[in-house]
């Protein structure tokens, strides 16, 4: 059960949102909806797995309601008509709080996990292969919707690996309600990989602001800086690394380093004081020649959120910012598997790292 190609995540899409699920639903597909329940207006939100954009054919309607003590409705809509509701009378969501909502498509049902605990299973009433669209509406703000394609599961899966894993790419920032992720580069078939999503949470009461998101006073996922993590298996052609975060309003510089032992194989260094994105390699504490050319203006902006996708290819790294290809960096250290450490530091707040 191996599927090639990958679906780009939708980053900070506006709600109401509708987006295409490339290739439709597959047995083993995992879809993660990450966001925050709005604390103000509205008592409901919904995630729909549907055919097309009309909303008349919804294979799975997942509908938390902050009414009557809180409950979640699950249902199916066929030709505009709703079937019998299935209600779960426990509410795992909290108003004003972030959530991590994961859907696993399986042959007999959808399994739904909320905040790390299995919440409900919803048995298919219509063939799930018909589903080609995900929509989200209601009193919710989205951080991202990501997709992990089914993969052959190891006989003895370790707890720290992903059984259904595939590198993903960032699309351009969503601009409309109906979005089809074009992908930045062609999605090449990739080998079975481990994808590790590193997640942390900031201290309660921390202010966190992005252009699309008003300041919020709840614990928002954010990383201690500097952030250092291992890249399991190191780099290899088709390996993807994804980061998202927010540039601090007073930022001078930040850096993303891919390291091999004491060497920095790839140093990505946006400098706001120079209005430049500097790239370089450091070997035995000696820097090489800088690369600074860009096809367009500086993509990082003080006070604004960003996403970076680093795709390793045989001869170079391809780097995209906010879904747009920015530059290629030809390998100077060519022993790719030894490049196995990611270091991020400087004047940013990280919100998502996937290696």
């Amino acid at each position: 059960m191996a599927f090639s190609g990958s679906q780009a995540p939708y980053l900070s899409p506006a709600v109401p949102f509708s987006g295409t699920i490339q290739g439709g639903l597959q047995d083993g597909l995992q879809i993660t909806v990450n966001g925050t329940v709005l604390s103000s207006s509205g008592t409901r939100f919904a995630v729909n797995f549907q055919t097309g954009f009309s909303g008349n054919d919804i294979a799975f309607h997942f509908n938390p309601r902050f009414e009557d003590g809180g409950y979640v409705v699950c249902n199916t809509r066929q030709n505009g008509s709703w079937g019998p509701e299935e209600r779960k009378t426990h509410m795992p969501f909290q108003k004003g709080m972030p959530f991590d909502l994961c859907f696993l498509v399986q042959s007999s049902d959808f399994k739904v996990m909320v905040n790390g605990i299995l919440f409900v299973q919803y048995f298919h009433r219509v063939p799930f292969h018909r589903v080609d669209t995900i929509s989200v509406n209601g009193s919710v703000q989205l951080s991202y919707i990501s997709f992990q394609n089914p993969r052959t599961v190891p006989v003895q899966p370790a707890f720290s690996t992903v059984p259904f894993s595939q590198p993903v790419c960032f699309p351009p920032r969503p601009r409309g309600r109906r979005q089809k992720p074009p992908g930045v580069w062609p999605a090449n078939p990739a080998p079975i990989t481990q994808t590790v999503i590193h997640t942390v949470q900031s201290a309660p009461g921390q202010m966190f602001s992005t252009p699309a998101i008003p300041p919020m006073m709840y614990p928002h996922p954010a990383y201690p800086m500097p952030f250092i993590t291992t890249i399991l298996g190191g780099l290899y052609p088709s390996k993807s690394i994804l980061l998202s975060g927010t540039v601090l309003p007073s930022a001078q510089r930040f850096h993303i380093n891919l390291c091999s032992g004491n060497h920095i194989a790839f140093h990505l260094n946006p400098r706001f004081d120079e209005n430049a994105v500097v790239r370089n390699t450091q070997i035995d504490n000696s820097w090489g020649s800088e690369e600074r050319s860009l096809p367009r203006k500086m993509p990082f902006v003080r006070g604004q959120s960003f996403s970076v996708w680093i795709l390793c290819e045989a001869h170079c790294l391809k780097v995209a910012v906010d879904g747009q290809h920015l530059f290629e960096y030809y390998h100077r250290l060519r022993n790719l598997p030894t490049i196995n450490r990611l270091e991020v530091g400087g004047d940013i707040q990280l919100t998502h790292v996937q290696t």
């Epitope: 909290q94 709080m97 299995l118 919440f119 707890f159 994808t195 309660p204 996922p221």
Partner: antibody
Framework: EVQLVESGGGLVQPGGSLRLSCAAS????????IHWVRQAPGKGLEWVAY????????SYADSVKGRFTISADTSKNTAYLQMNSLRAEDTAVYYC????????????????WGQGTLVTVSS | DIQMTQSPSSLSASVGDRVTITCRAS??????VAWYQQKPGKAPKLLIY???SLYSGVPSRFSGSRSGTDFTLTISSLQPEDFATYYC???????????FGQGTKVEIK
């Protein structure tokens, strides 16, 4: 190597407070849900609370709701259990355990446990 | 709350015996069930996760199965180191998202 180490247990009078710590190594607490489970002398396992640091979500057993607070400091890679208004029936060995990492969330089980810390509530 | 009714509460068996322990959930919990082994003075150890998957490093004589809301832990050939207490545990979101069975003490006959 993944490891969980509890500390902070001890003897406390009824109505008193204790704060238990669960220091993690070999993984980040933010990529898992962290649970506290207790075991009274000669009794079975009882789930107490959990935190999913990625979203900040917490949940408690009815028996401790309003008295215990679970939290996590991701910069210290440590989870905590603040226990207030302690009662004699809270006497137990308290374990922290890791439940399914973020990246393998469809795997259901607590794969790593600490050695436990004894809390005795007695006058 | 979802109740996990575990039986028997204790059993006596000999080395080489086939041992079966069952847990019945009071409502559907999908496959979100794990089995643990605990020895006196020690923390529990995970044996089976997701109802039927053998955890890494656990001997293959341990197996788990599911039939509806009934879950079974089987030790195909009991070994001396297997004398311990065994617990089932469900993690399906309810008022208490985690509940354990009462435990089964496996003793030497």
């Amino acid at each position: 190597e993944v490891q969980l180490v509890e500390s902070g247990g001890g003897l406390v009078q009824p109505g008193g407070s204790l704060r238990l710590s669960c220091a993690a190594s070999g993984f980040t607490v933010s990529s898992s849900s962290i649970h506290w489970v207790r075991q009274a002398p000669g009794k079975g396992l009882e789930w107490v609370a959990y935190i999913y640091p990625y979203s900040g979500y917490t949940s408690y057993a009815d028996s401790v709701k309003g008295r215990f607070t679970i939290s996590a400091d991701t910069s210290k890679n440590t989870a905590y259990l603040q226990m207030n208004s302690l009662r004699a029936e809270d006497t137990a060995v308290y374990y922290c355990a890791r439940y399914s990492t973020y990246s393998s969330k469809w795997v259901w089980g607590m794969d790593y446990w600490g050695q436990g810390t004894l809390v005795t509530v007695s006058s | 709350d979802i109740q996990m009714t575990q039986s028997p509460s204790s059993l006596s068996a000999s080395v080489g015996d086939r041992v079966t322990i069952t847990c019945r959930a009071s409502q559907s919990v999908s496959s979100a069930v794990a089995w643990y082994q605990q020895k006196p003075g020690k923390a529990p150890k995970l044996l089976i996760y997701s109802a039927s998957s053998l955890y890494s490093g656990v001997p293959s004589r341990f197996s788990g199965s599911r039939s509806g809301t009934d879950f079974t832990l089987t030790i195909s050939s009991l070994q001396p180191e297997d004398f311990a207490t065994y617990y089932c545990q469900q993690s399906y979101y309810d008022s208490n998202p985690i509940t354990f069975g009462q435990g089964t003490k496996v003793e030497i006959k």
